[in-house]
């Protein structure tokens, strides 16, 4: 078929409207002015263009803006955003949170795509840090977003942004990530009273050191077993039986069901059997009476 490049008489588009869905690809290419498309991008989202037609519209914008689209166009891309590649997005300079929200809305309900990941990366790098409003927005669309960041990236999260984090946002975080987030959370919530503080800090405790757990044990917090099981093993090991009992409160009985799992298993091995017996839970595996426990790590440090 001979390539048709001239726009047929009477078909020149005067506005972006639904009549364009009846155009063939070559007619769209020939009859739609790229500058018109750019100024009326907000209309595209309401019109059911086919994927092939969207390819043509994207091509027209690419020709008009070879160095990357301006934010005025990006904000109104609508579902044409789904046609963008990460390479396209790397050319953009997105500074407005409204633009970010508009594009995240397009992808709502789906897994985070490479396009969205690139968009977020560009946005956050442009801002210099993950401020509270951005974090609020991102975790609203992608609850697992925070845990997809490296510890290095998380270090740019200011403590004030921690207020936007919900417990479910941390579900998939590993200990290295919580190690970074916990001190920020501790700082963010430092002026709260005991019980309110514990409610807020609880989700972050997978990054807490021993001394903070000891301090919590003095505050009648009644930590649940699910939270206890997510604590760092190295932070739990030095806790005494009395401290764990105070930390867990009525939930201490749950230790029996978890005695074969870390960190409970490793903690039991470090406790005197006599002390474990005081709990009345039938926990076994502690250090038998009369045995001397040498902390070899201390000995090495002294020599």
């Amino acid at each position: 078929e001979v390539e048709k490049t001239a726009c047929p008489s009477g078909k020149k588009a005067r506005e972006i409207d639904e009549s364009l869905i009846f155009y063939k690809k070559w007619e769209l290419e020939a009859c739609v002015d790229a500058a018109l498309l750019a100024t009326q991008m907000d209309r595209v989202n309401a019109i059911p263009f086919t994927y092939e037609q969207l390819d043509v519209l994207k091509h027209k914008l690419d020709e008009l803006y070879p160095q990357g689209y301006p934010e005025s166009v990006i904000q109104h891309l609508g579902y044409l955003f789904l046609k963008m590649s990460p390479e396209d997005i790397r050319k953009w300079n997105v500074t407005s949170l409204e633009t970010l929200k508009a594009l995240l809305e397009v992808n709502k309900g789906h897994e985070m795509s490479p396009q969205v990941a690139t968009l977020i990366d560009r946005f956050v790098k442009g801002r210099g840090q993950l401020d509270k409003d951005t974090l609020d927005t991102l975790t609203a669309f992608y609850p697992g977003y925070l845990c997809s960041l490296s510890p290095e990236e998380l270090s740019s999260v200011p403590p004030s942004s921690i207020w936007a984090v919900r417990p479910q946002d941390l579900d998939t975080c590993d200990p290295r990530q919580l190690d970074v987030l916990y001190p920020k959370a501790r700082l963010a919530f430092q002026n709260m009273n005991g019980s309110e503080y514990f409610v807020k800090i609880q989700s972050f405790l997978g990054g807490a050191p021993t001394e903070d757990l000891k301090a919590l044990s003095q505050q009648n917090v009644s930590m649940d077993l699910a939270t206890f099981m997510k604590l760092r093993t190295d932070a739990v090991l030095p806790l005494t039986v009395a401290e764990v009992q105070k930390l867990l409160g009525p939930h201490v009985e749950g230790l029996k069901a978890e005695e074969r799992h870390r960190p409970v298993r490793d903690w039991i091995l470090r406790q005197r059997q006599d002390d474990l017996d005081t709990l009345g839970l039938g926990l076994q595996g502690g250090i038998p009476n009369g045995y001397l426990v040498l902390d070899l790590s201390m000995q090495e440090a002294l020599s």
Partner: nanobody, 112 residues
Amino acid sequence: QVQLVESGGGLVQPGGSLRLSCVVSGRTLESYVMAWFRQAPGKGLEAVASINWSSGRLIYADFVKGRFTISRDNSKNTLYLQMNSLRPEDTAVYYCAAGRYWGQGTQVTVSS
């Protein structure tokens, strides 16, 4: 999210009629253009008819003018396509679309 579910397709003889329905749920449609598309075996998607939900403007492809009628029932959130004087070349999967959202399609076969 918007869901679109088409129904009403089937086997019909040349010259016969069918009425396709598309029930829309999940979001109000005031801001959308709705349309019927079709895809014949081995061919690309082509627009059949459209209706602008807010203005009521109707547009038809040349190949169905005078034979097909697009309409809507706001109270039922339903889009229709009345197809009369059907021809063998109308055989295709017919899809309903609203903005970026598309249905799964319903098969129309015109054959004697």
